[in-house]
């Protein structure tokens, strides 16, 4: 079965800056990736970025530098310390739409005791939804 992994890391140099990495462990071709925070899209979350293999990338503040790392993984940086910025216990979710598997989504957050510069291991977080 396909799985999605989510890794959240707080940058040592900028305590209000996070790096989010997500990947899809499956054999299908990915048609769209949606990254959200505060929960899954459609369940109280806010879209941070959408990445499409051909149609490009859109990101919304405080997201920066959303990009494909490989054909099946993406990363983005969250910056800033304003009211619309994440805190240490924020949940980040990644949803991968692929063919023929369908949509798979997982969420993750910063480990409770993580030091700046350390990251959560890229665990396949619980699959929240498979459409």
């Amino acid at each position: 079965t396909p799985e999605v992994w989510v890794q959240v890391r707080m940058e040592a140099t900028e305590l209000s800056s996070f790096t989010i990495r997500c990947g899809f462990l499956g054999s299908g071709s990915i048609s769209l990736v949606t990254v959200s925070w505060g929960g899954p899209n459609g369940a109280g979350g806010t879209t941070l970025a959408v990445l499409h293999p051909e149609r490009g990338i859109r990101q919304w503040a405080p997201a920066r530098q959303a990009r494909w790392e490989t054909q099946s993984s993406i990363s983005l940086i969250l910056e800033g310390s304003g009211a619309s910025s994440p805190c240490a216990n924020t949940t980040f979710c990644c949803k991968f739409a692929s063919f023929p598997e369908g949509s798979w989504e997982a969420c993750g957050s910063l480990p409770p005791s993580s030091d700046p510069g350390l990251s959560a291991p890229p665990t396949p977080a619980p699959i929240l939804r498979a459409d």
Partner: antibody
Framework: QVQLQQSGPELVKPGTSVKISCKAS????????INWVKQRPGQGLEWIGW????????YYNEKFKGRATLTVDKSSSTAYMLLSSLTSEDSAVYFC????????????WGQGTTLTVSS | DIQMTQSPSSLSASLGGKVTITCKAS??????IAWFQHKPGKGPRLLIH???TLQSGIPSRFSGSGSGGDYSFSISNLEPEDIATYYC????????FGGGTTLEIK
């Protein structure tokens, strides 16, 4: 088809507040950012801020922080902008616009709401 | 904040002719620029996004190009209905509009 229908013109006194509405139809309201844009008479367009209806999360242009408040009512697919402590500088046409994501920014617009602040 | 400098502020051209408008960003905006047509009493209309992608239903007389901080927008074979004000918008980070260009037909 996608439509954004804004409330009618407003004539208000300085120092008061006004709430402008933007009713969305023809798409899933909670999936797309709604932006608000200001246009003063004879001038250009100025971005005020956005709200993501699915979560209510907002982001404001620094210039409008504390003066504009964006909210949504998911049950009626309506976005609102409250402008407070009004002055003559707030007299303008205000537009709501959907951000279409990969389809492009501000792909659908409301028709505009004219606000006149005068004593 | 990213600033957008649009020029010219107004221009006049003949029917059937071609016009070009430029927008200069204060930093690299990674091709995240859109162009809008705005007519009085209406909401603006998205013509082009991501520098050169034509919005659905927009005629190919409209085109865009550029990279880094320098972008241009052109209308060829000008028609009477092209009379409007045109704006660029950067959306690489948040949003900033250019000052606008008012197009008149000679």
């Amino acid at each position: 088809q996608v439509q954004l229908q804004q409330s009618g013109p407003e004539l208000v006194k300085p120092g008061t507040s006004v709430k402008i509405s933007c009713k969305a139809s023809g798409y899933t309201f909670t999936d797309y950012y709604i932006n608000w844009v200001k246009q003063r008479p004879g001038q250009g367009l100025e971005w005020i801020g956005w709200i993501f209806p699915g979560s209510g999360n907002t982001y404001y242009n620094e210039k409008f922080k504390g003066r504009a408040t964006l909210t949504v009512d998911k049950s009626s697919s309506t976005a609102y902008m409250l402008l407070s402590s009004l002055t003559s500088e707030d007299s303008a046409v205000y537009f709501c616009a959907r951000d279409g994501g990969l389809r492009g920014p501000f792909d659908y617009w409301g028709q505009g709401t004219t606000l006149t602040v005068s004593s | 904040d990213i600033q957008m400098t649009q020029s010219p502020s107004s221009l006049s051209a003949s029917l059937g002719g071609k016009v070009t408008i430029t927008c200069k960003a204060s930093q690299d905006i990674n091709k995240y620029i859109a162009w809008f047509q705005h007519k009085p009493g209406k909401g603006p209309r998205l013509l082009i996004h991501f520098t050169s992608t034509l919005q659905s239903g927009i005629p190919s007389r409209f085109s865009g190009s550029g990279s880094g901080g320098d972008y241009s927008f052109s209308i060829s074979n000008l028609e009477p209905e092209d009379i409007a004000t045109y704006y660029c918008l950067q959306y690489d980070y948040l949003y900033t509009f250019g000052g606008g260009t008012t197009l008149e037909i000679k």
